[in-house]
Structure formats: C-alpha cells, structure tokens
C-alpha cells in the first residue's frame, strides 16, 4: 500500500525530474514540481489586426496564444516573442502563407521574394541568429486573378531558458490571416544531458 | 526483490498512466494497460487506386496503413479518416506531391491551385475545421514536358479521443502516387494536463 | 529510504529501458545505461566546401554535426550518412534551399527540377529506399536577377540500429550554404513495441 502510493506520485507524470525532486524535498514537492515541469509547447497563430505594411523583412509581433488552435504551456509569449522557460531540445516549426487577389489592388512589383526567417535571440548576448529560413521568389503576374504560396520550415534546436524565438517575413501585407495558414510553434522533445 | 519486480512492470513502459492504473487494479492490469497506452502514431501513404477525378477540393479517403512505410499504432484508420483513440497533444504533418507529364494528356487549365488542407472533425459536433493548409498557385505551361510541386505542412494540436483527421487536396488527379511523395501522419508528444 | 533510493535510479531517466536494465545488472549499471540510452537526435547542416557540381541527382556527403546549430547525440555521422544507433521510431526532416544570383553566371537551362530525396540504406540489405521526397520544377528566367526556392519534408519512420539516412538533391551547385537554409535531422520519439 505504501509503496503503491509513493509510486503514484513518482511515476504518474511522464516527464518529472525525479532524482532532483526526491533529493530536494518531500513527495508533495515532487508532485508539484512534476506538474510545473511538464513538457513545454506553443502553437501561435497570426493576429492579422496588426500586420506591418511594406515589402521589406519585418518581425511579426502579433500572435494569438489562447484562441482557436493557438495554445501555450510552460513557455511565455511576450512582445512578439516566444520565450523559453525550460532548457531543452525543442522541435521548432513555422507555416507561412502568402496570398493576393486582384480585388486587393495591383502589386507594386510582380517579382516577389516571399520569405520566412525563424530567429533566436539570447538576452545575455543581445543578438539575433536565424535558425531556419525558407521561401521562394515568385512571379505573380496580372494574368491570374489569384495567387497563393506557402512555406513550411522545421528543425530541432537546443534552447536555453530566457532565449526568445521570433518570426520574420518579407511582404507581410500579403500574409494569409487564417489560423490554419500562418502560425509557428515549438514543443520540447528532451532534456539537455 | 519484490520491489524490483513491481517496478519492472511500472517503469518498463515509458508512457503508462500509472496513477490511474495503480488505483484501478493489480500490477498485472497495470502492465497490460501500459502496453495499450503506448504513444500513438500513424504514417499513412496514398493509395492511388481510387483517386477522385475532379479539380475541386476533395477529401482523400484511400490511404495505406500497413505496407511499405505506412504504419499505425494506437490510432485507427477508418472511412478515409485517421481516428484518435487517446487524448493528447500530437504533432500532425502532411507531405503532398503533385506532378504532370505531357504524356498524361493536356491540362484543362495551365493555371492551377495546388493545395492541401488537414482537417479535424469531431463526432460530438459534426463539423470540420481546418488545422493546417498549404500550397501554391502554379502556371504549368506546355513549354515544359514535366511539372512537379510538393507541399509540406506540420503543427502541434490538442486532439481528443474520437476526433478524426482527414486530408483534402485540390486537383487530386495530379497527385504523385509514390509512398515517399504523398503521405500524412501524426504522433503523440504528450498528455493533456 | 531504501525504496526512495532505488526509485531515484529507475525513474530518474525518462527514457531508460528499465525492464532490460533491472534484469541484466545492478542499479549502478542501470544508471549508466539510462544515460547511454537517452533519446537520440541529430541536426546536420550543410558543409558547402565540398558541394558536387552538375544538375543531376547526387548524394550530399558533407555535413556539419558539431558547429553552429549542428549537433548529434546517440547517433553517428559517417561517410555522409546519418547512422542509427538505437532502434526506434524517429521523426525525420530536411530543409533544402536553392538560390541563384545573376552574378553567379548564366544557368545552363532556365527550366529546373529542384528536388530532395531523403533515403534509408540498410547495411544488411545494401539497397537504398526513398523515405521522403519533395521539390518543384521552376522556371528561373533571366528577367529576374535573383531566384530562391526552399523545400521542407518531414515524416515519422521506424529505424533500426545500423540503418543509414542520407540526403540526395538535384542541382547541388544551386544549394544555399547557410546553416539556417540547408539542413536535415532526426529525433527519436518512441521505442519500437
């Protein structure tokens, strides 16, 4: 009976740091800590109410984190950046859709660079580094009334607590504002050894 | 000795729901249940023997689940849909390849919308919602004898038992029927808190 | 106290093969083994110092595994191939960027097939099988001074110890040599039942 009860606390959560927990405190502390340390994740969808204009590369700062498909756990979204709260190896991904319909008006140029850059910023060393990029040059001629293009990138990266992930795109005014179209996210896969 | 033996059952499977298991029944039940509750996954590859003929958006219902790279575990494939058997957060992905060779005949139009939509349907609320979309408008002119284009989408979503995942595409008759070309899948990453 | 200590060893590592460990040896062995068996992963970035020429399909053999974003753990990189050391189900991914600037000279043809193939080779059966492919035919006309295109593929596969993953591309001389542009990787998600 006693063994079973103790095991319930320990084994109940898949991702606890049991060794540390059991040395540092009581079984109750362990249970609390195991909950806090559940694997972090985020899936952020574009908030199109505040999309920058222009065709240059801009950082997208408006994302939803708690409506529709958007969600976050054990990570923080602040000032347009996804902040890591827990060291680990994470799979990062982004899906970015661009579209143009002739009813939106004429494009300034028919030759476009439609690009995404997923970047990491460290607070300690305040510089930004691109983790992943993708995209395409496109010729969106007036012969077609509608144009569409999507980019997907993904990769596995070591992230430290406090580091920030952000997304930059070119031609932000062409972004598709649907939650199924333009989003990015992360989920922790494993601890750092 | 006794403790060790009991632990073998409990810890042996990484993904057991130990708390529930230990309250509900014996160690033997726990071992059985731990096997049943192993992390679900699926990788489904296109079955091109029954591709719809239109150019409009259609749901693809013919997929392989047990040949070549295709496989499924703790999920169900039925009526063209991937059914979730275990609540959790899943990474979903799809790779869709379209191709055309001049020997296949003349395209009805050279301006194509090549798109994929990964959708979720809930039995309780019988409506379909698009989780992810991707694709591109393409101009596949007769100047080139061969055309090819691939789409990849992926994202992290909360799925409940009984929910169904399906894939819709435009221009299904242009799909590349190879198992390495057109597929979709899912794997569970973590439980819902 | 004794129970707690034993539990520390067992539960401390999320990904141990506890049953095997406890049968085969002492608690100390178990702790060591748990470290060795931590979930494998790799993220390899292109080493552009040795890119093949030509426009045909070639295997890319030069990748970084320990600089910048590149890293590897419990997998081996040898002779241009990523070697699996631990049976399991893995998520595999690749991101391949192609680019051309007019300052690089004229393209031999403006009609290009820009493709990636992620392949698996088994030492026991020395044949190569394509797990994933993606890409696009492109018309990179001289009207534009710069062209760019990226491909992303990903999927979930059963891999056995000793199997090798490699990446083939067409038009390798057009590859973008940046570490954020051209890379591939894998991470283990779960054991084989």
């Amino acid at each position: 009976g006693a063994v079973q009860k103790e095991l319930q606390h320990i084994v109940g959560s898949q991702h606890i740091r049991a060794e540390k927990a059991m040395v540092d405190g009581s079984w109750l502390d362990l249970a609390k800590r195991s909950k806090l340390e559940a694997q972090p994740f985020a899936h952020l969808t574009i908030n199109a109410t505040d999309i920058p204009t222009g065709s240059h590369k801009v950082s997208l700062s408006s994302w939803y984190h708690d409506r529709g498909w958007a969600k976050i756990s054990n990570m923080t979204f602040s000032n347009g950046k996804l902040i890591v709260n827990q060291d680990g190896f994470y799979y990062l991904y982004a899906n970015i859709c661009f579209r143009h319909h002739e009813t939106s008006g004429d494009l300034a140029t028919e030759y476009l660079q439609l690009m995404v850059y997923v970047t990491k910023t460290s607070i300690k060393i305040p510089s930004s580094h691109t983790l992943m990029k993708g995209g395409s040059t496109k010729y969106w001629s007036g012969n077609s009334e509608f144009h569409f293009y999507s980019i997907n990138v993904g990769g596995f990266f070591k992230l430290r607590s406090g580091e920030e992930i952000s997304v930059e795109v070119s031609n932000p005014s062409l972004l598709d504002p649907d939650q199924d179209a333009t989003y990015f996210g992360a989920f922790k896969v494993r601890d750092i050894d | 000795g006794a403790v060790q033996k009991e632990l073998q059952h409990i810890v042996g499977s990484q993904h057991i729901r130990a708390e529930k298991a230990m309250v509900d029944g014996s160690w033997l039940d726990l071992a059985k249940r731990s096997k049943l509750e192993a992390q679900p996954f699926a990788h489904l590859t296109i079955n091109a023997t029954d591709i719809p003929t239109g150019s409009h958006k259609v749901s693809l219902s013919s997929w392989y689940h047990d040949r070549g790279w295709a496989k499924i575990s703790n999920m169900t494939f039925s009526n063209g849909k991937l059914i979730v058997n275990q609540d959790g957060f899943y990474y979903l992905y799809a790779n869709i390849c379209f191709r055309h060779h001049e020997t296949s005949g003349d395209l009805a139009t050279e301006y194509l919308q090549l798109m994929v939509y990964v959708t979720k349907t809930s039995i309780k609320i019988p409506s379909s919602h698009t989780l992810m979309k991707g694709g591109s408008t393409k101009y596949w002119s007769g100047n080139s004898e061969f055309h090819f284009y691939s789409i990849n989408v992926g994202g992290f979503f909360k799925l409940r038992s009984g929910e169904e995942i399906s894939v819709e595409v435009s221009n299904p008759s242009l799909l590349d029927p190879d198992q390495d070309a057109t597929y979709f899948g899912a794997f569970k990453v973590r439980d819902i808190d | 106290g004794a129970v707690q200590k034993e539990l520390q060893h067992i539960v401390g590592s999320q990904h141990i093969r506890a049953e095997k460990a406890m049968v085969d040896g002492s608690w100390l062995d178990l702790a060591k083994r748990s470290k060795l068996e931590a979930q494998p992963f790799a993220h390899l970035t292109i080493n552009a110092t040795d890119i093949p020429t030509g426009s045909h399909k070639v295997s890319l053999s030069s990748w970084y595994h320990d600089r910048g974003w590149a890293k590897i753990s419990n997998m081996t990189f040898s002779n241009g191939k990523l070697i699996v050391n631990q049976d399991g189900f893995y998520y595999l991914y690749a991101n391949i960027c192609f680019r051309h600037h007019e300052t690089s000279g004229d393209l031999a043809t403006e009609y290009l097939q820009l493709m990636v193939y992620v392949t698996k080779t088994s030492i026991k059966i020395p044949s190569s099988h394509t797990l994933m492919k993606g890409g696009s035919t492109k018309y990179w006309s001289g009207n534009s001074e710069f062209h760019f295109y990226s491909i992303n593929v990903g999927g979930f596969f059963k891999l056995r110890s000793g199997e090798e993953i490699s990446v083939e591309v067409s038009n390798p001389s057009l590859l973008d040599p940046d570490q954020d542009a051209t890379y591939f990787g894998a991470f283990k998600v779960r054991d084989i039942d």
Partner: antibody, heavy 121, light 107 residues
Framework: QVQLVESGGGVVQPGRSLRLSCAAS????????MHWVRQAPGKGLEWVAV????????YYADSVKGRFTISRDNSKNTLYLQMNSLRAEDTAVYYC????????WGYGMDVWGQGTTVTVS | DIQMTQSPSTLSASVGDRVTITCRAS??????LAWYQQKPGKAPKLLIY???SLESGVPSRFSGSGSGTEFTLTISSLQPDDFATYYC?????????FGQGTKVEIK
C-alpha cells in the same frame, strides 16, 4: 443524383440568336470541364464547344467558331451556350455533357443531359 | 484536322454473339479515345475512356483496345440491351471529333 438539365431551345429564324442553359446538380460543378455536343436529325454526334472548370479556357469546333460562346457561372452551377448568327445547319438537339476528368482533357464525357432542340428555319 | 472512320456502319448480330467495332484515326492520337452507346431518343452513354478503361457501372462484357491509329470496341456476348448505335470519339490538341457511328441491330 448526378444530373444535367438543358433549357432554352426553340424555333428561331436564321441570323438570330439564342441562349441555351444547362443546370447541373449532384456533383461539384466547379471541378469539371463542360461540353456542348449536338446531333442533327438522323445524324451522328458533333462536338461544339468546351470550357474548363474555372472558365479560363474555351475551345470551339470550326463550324461554330466566332458565332457561339460557351460560358459558365460556378456560383449558379450553370453552363451556357450563346448562339449568334444562327444558320439552318445549326438545327439539332443540343446536349451538355460533363468531362470525366476536371484536370485533364481527353477522358471522355461521363454525364449527359437529355438535350434541348434548336430549330433554325 | 484528324478524321475518325468507324466500321462497319451497320452490324447485324444475335444475342450471345461476340461483336467488334473498329475506329481508325487519320493520325496518331495515342490512347485518347472514348466509346459511347446511344439509344434512339436518348443521350449518349460513356462506355470506355482512354481507349481501354471501363467506365464505372458499365458491364464487363464491354472492352476497348488499341492505341495510335486503330482502336476496337468489343462486346464479348451481345445482350438484348446492347442493340444501339455506338460512337468513337477522339481527343487531340483541344479538339474533339466523333466517328460517324455504328448501328448494331438484331439479325
């Protein structure tokens, strides 16, 4: 069920115009190319015109080129044939027919309407 | 323009007979050929497309073969419902042409 229903036929004098309609139901109209085929009394079948699923491409038989116009309204699931400068040899039963493939030409016509009669005299 | 020549123009046969109708194209059309059945006062019905593919719902006694310039429609065992006129139809370069038809009548 899948159905095509033609209307708009009738008797018309040479040189005049007529517009035929074809109402589609039971399938995704916007996903398929559509044809007009005619059959003069006691004669064989003659292909008249075709339009792609999105309306971007239209092709005509030499015998009607410049006089007939094929069009479609996907929001109304309706196909049209505007016939101008009608001649006596245009007298026929006019069928609308669905292309078997929406993406490719050449796969045949798998659904046909019952036809509407046009008499030019 | 590519011409389509069907033969024979009329064919008399009995129930249970094996019937073959031929269609010749004046130029190579690959396998872009379809076969239709039409009964008096009715719309045509697609039987075969791409020279040899059987349309859904069509009885398996109907089959098509050939490529290039010579094509055949075969009815392996003629049934009472099969007495009708049969048309071949070719596709080539955004143009469709029907053959003149073959009438299959009761002997």
């Amino acid at each position: 069920q899948v159905q095509l229903v033609e209307s708009g036929g009738g008797v018309v004098q040479p040189g005049r115009s007529l517009r035929l309609s074809c109402a589609a139901s039971g399938f995704t109209f916007s996903g398929y190319g559509m044809h007009w085929v005619r059959q003069a009394p006691g004669k064989g079948l003659e292909w008249v015109a075709v339009i792609s699923y999105d309306g971007t491409n239209k092709y005509y038989a030499d015998s009607v080129k410049g006089r007939f116009t094929i069009s479609r309204d996907n929001s109304k699931n309706t196909l049209y044939l505007q016939m101008n400068s009608l001649r006596a040899e245009d007298t026929a039963v006019y069928y609308c027919a669905k292309s078997l493939s929406g993406t490719y030409w050449g796969y045949g016509m798998d659904v046909w309407g019952q036809g509407t009669t046009v008499t030019v005299s | 323009d590519i011409q389509m020549t069907q033969s024979p123009s009329t064919l008399s046969a009995s129930v249970g007979d094996r019937v073959t109708i031929t269609c010749r194209a004046s130029q190579n059309i690959g396998n872009w050929l379809a076969w239709y059945q039409q009964k008096p006062g009715k719309a045509p019905k697609l039987l075969i497309y791409k020279a040899s593919s059987l349309e859904s719902g069509v009885p398996s006694r109907f089959s098509g073969s050939g490529s290039g310039t010579e094509f055949t429609l075969t009815i392996s065992s003629l049934q009472p419902d099969d007495f009708a006129t049969y048309y071949c139809q070719r596709y080539n370069s955004y143009s469709w042409t029907f053959g003149q038809g073959t009438k299959v009548e009761i002997k």
